[in-house]
Structure formats: structure tokens, C-alpha cells
């Protein structure tokens, strides 16, 4: 038995996690670059 609501919910959750991870990586990179430039 499969129900789309669990896949919809989980896919949404994982997309949000991926975006958060990406933004953290980008912001972390920028911060390191700023520190390096100082």
C-alpha cells in the first residue's frame, strides 16, 4: 500500500533541507572569503 501524502510530505521536507544546506554552504563560503580578505 502506498499513499502519496507521505511521499509529498517527505519530498517537501527533503527539498527544504537541501535548500538550507546549500544556503549554509554559500554563506559559509562568503564568510571564509571575507575573513581571508581581511
Amino acid at each position: 500500500h502506498s499513499d502519496g501524502i507521505f511521499t509529498d510530505s517527505y519530498s517537501r521536507y527533503r527539498k527544504q533541507m537541501a535548500v538550507k544546506k546549500y544556503l549554509a554552504a554559500v554563506l559559509g563560503k562568503r564568510y571564509k572569503q571575507r575573513v581571508k580578505n581581511k
Partner: antibody
Framework: AEGGLVKPGGSLELCCKA??????????MCWVRQAPGKGLEWIGC????????DYASWVNGQFTLSRDIDQSTGCLQLNSLTVADTAMYYC??????WGPGTLVTVSS | AQVLTQTPSSVSAAVGGTVTINCQSS????????LSWFQQKPGQPPKGLIA???TLASGVPSRFKGSGSGTQFTLTISGVQCDDAAAYYC?????????????FGGGTEVVVK
């Protein structure tokens, strides 16, 4: 997935084969275990697209997730097994579709 | 690591009665609503009942209701039937960056008299 009897310190690989949908369709395959008479315990998840993984902190490198897109399988490698790892191991697609589970018994 | 405390661990109800199962999360689940409920009968894998704290899966009777947000969640079974005798588990989704992605509650055994 093939379970069975393993001696303490031994290893075992459990594999879950996708049927009715393709592993190449990309989703998260998660693994959950349940010791006899106990509750459910999350082990980890693997994304079938990139192979990206997340593990429960207690796993501590003892278990490893992998996937084979060509064979439409997701696998869980169990290492350094102890009696405490005796459990029914379930694979699940997005916590939506669940496999029947496979019993792993660790005993000397 | 996060903790999902499920209470009670066991509950007995008469047919037609009401069962309330609580799930308390520490910290809050992600987005305050990423919590699912599962039903498990002996010898079977879990079956999804409710996603996103309150969305009922198709084919699940309307006597099952999920509610709550953040750290406090409830599964209510109104008009309990014999078929509802099972173990029930909550599952939280968390911020993977700072803690484990998931945790299950300890489970609640529902006995129907």
C-alpha cells in the same frame, strides 16, 4: 532482503529491491529497525539520485547505506554486529511504501 | 539528539470509546508540522496514518485525527473499533543540519476490549 543468523562480530548486507517503480525515479530510501517486542528505531536514509546519506547519530559508522541504480536496489551493510542488533530491519520509500522486513538474529 | 516522548505506553479502550495518544518532541519538529503517525499490527510493517501532523492518508477511517504543532502532538481515535488494536508510533522530521533527521516515539499499545 535476506536476513538470518549471524555470529557476534560478524557482518551482513541487507538489500531492498524496488518493484513497480524505478530507483532511477529518485526518492529517499530509509531503513528502520525493531528489536523483538520493542519500538521502531530510525537507522538512516539514502537518496537514490545522488547517493547522499543521513544516519542516526547512534550508528557511529557501524552501518553503511548504498544503492545500485542498475539493479534497482538499496542496501544496508551491517558490521561489527552484537546481540543488541538483533531486530527486524525494514526498508521504506519516503516512509510511504514499506518492505515486509527481514529478521537479523545475532547469536553465538 | 532529539527526543520524542510518547504517552501512554499502553492504553485500553472499550469499543466505541475514545483513545488519545500524545507525542512530545524536544526540540520542535521541522517547520512545526513535520510529524507523522503510524499503525503497526503484529508481524506487519508500519502503515502510515497521518502526515504533516494532521493530514489523513487515503483509506484511513475518519475516526483517526491528528493535531498539534511544534513540540506537542496528539493522535485521537474516536469510536474505537476492534480493528484499531495495534501499536501506534509518531515520527518526527528534524533539521538534519543540527541533529538527527528523524526520531520515532516509543510507541503506544492500544488494547480494545
Amino acid at each position: 532482503a535476506e536476513g538470518g543468523l549471524v555470529k557476534p562480530g560478524g557482518s551482513l548486507e541487507l538489500c531492498c529491491k524496488a518493484s513497480g517503480f524505478s530507483l532511477s525515479s529518485t526518492y529517499w530510501m530509509c531503513w528502520v529497525r525493531q528489536a523483538p517486542g520493542k519500538g521502531l528505531e530510525w537507522i538512516g536514509c539514502i537518496y537514490t539520485g545522488s547517493g547522499s546519506t543521513d544516519y542516526a547519530s547512534w550508528v557511529n559508522g557501524q552501518f553503511t547505506l548504498s544503492r545500485d541504480i542498475d539493479q534497482s536496489t538499496g542496501c544496508l551493510q551491517l558490521n561489527s554486529l552484537t546481540v543488541a542488533d538483533t531486530a527486524m530491519y525494514y526498508c521504506t520509500k519516503n516512509f510511504d511504501l514499506w518492505g515486509p522486513g527481514t529478521l537479523v538474529t545475532v547469536s553465538s | 539528539a532529539q527526543v520524542l516522548t510518547q504517552t501512554p505506553s499502553s492504553v485500553s479502550a472499550a469499543v466505541g470509546g475514545t483513545v488519545t495518544i500524545n507525542c512530545q518532541s524536544s526540540p520542535s519538529v521541522y517547520s512545526n508540522n513535520y510529524l507523522s503517525w503510524f499503525q503497526q499490527k503484529p508481524g506487519q510493517p508500519p502503515k502510515g496514518l497521518i502526515a504533516d501532523a494532521s493530514t489523513l492518508a487515503s483509506g484511513v477511517p475518519s475516526r483517526f485525527k491528528g493535531s498539534g504543532s511544534g513540540t506537542q502532538f496528539t493522535l485521537t481515535i474516536s469510536g474505537v473499533q476492534c480493528d484499531d488494536a495495534a501499536a501506534y508510533y509518531c515520527l518526527g522530521y528534524y533539521d538534519c543540519g543540527s541533529t538527527d533527521c528523524h526520531a520515532f516515539g516509543g510507541g503506544t499499545e492500544v488494547v480494545v476490549k
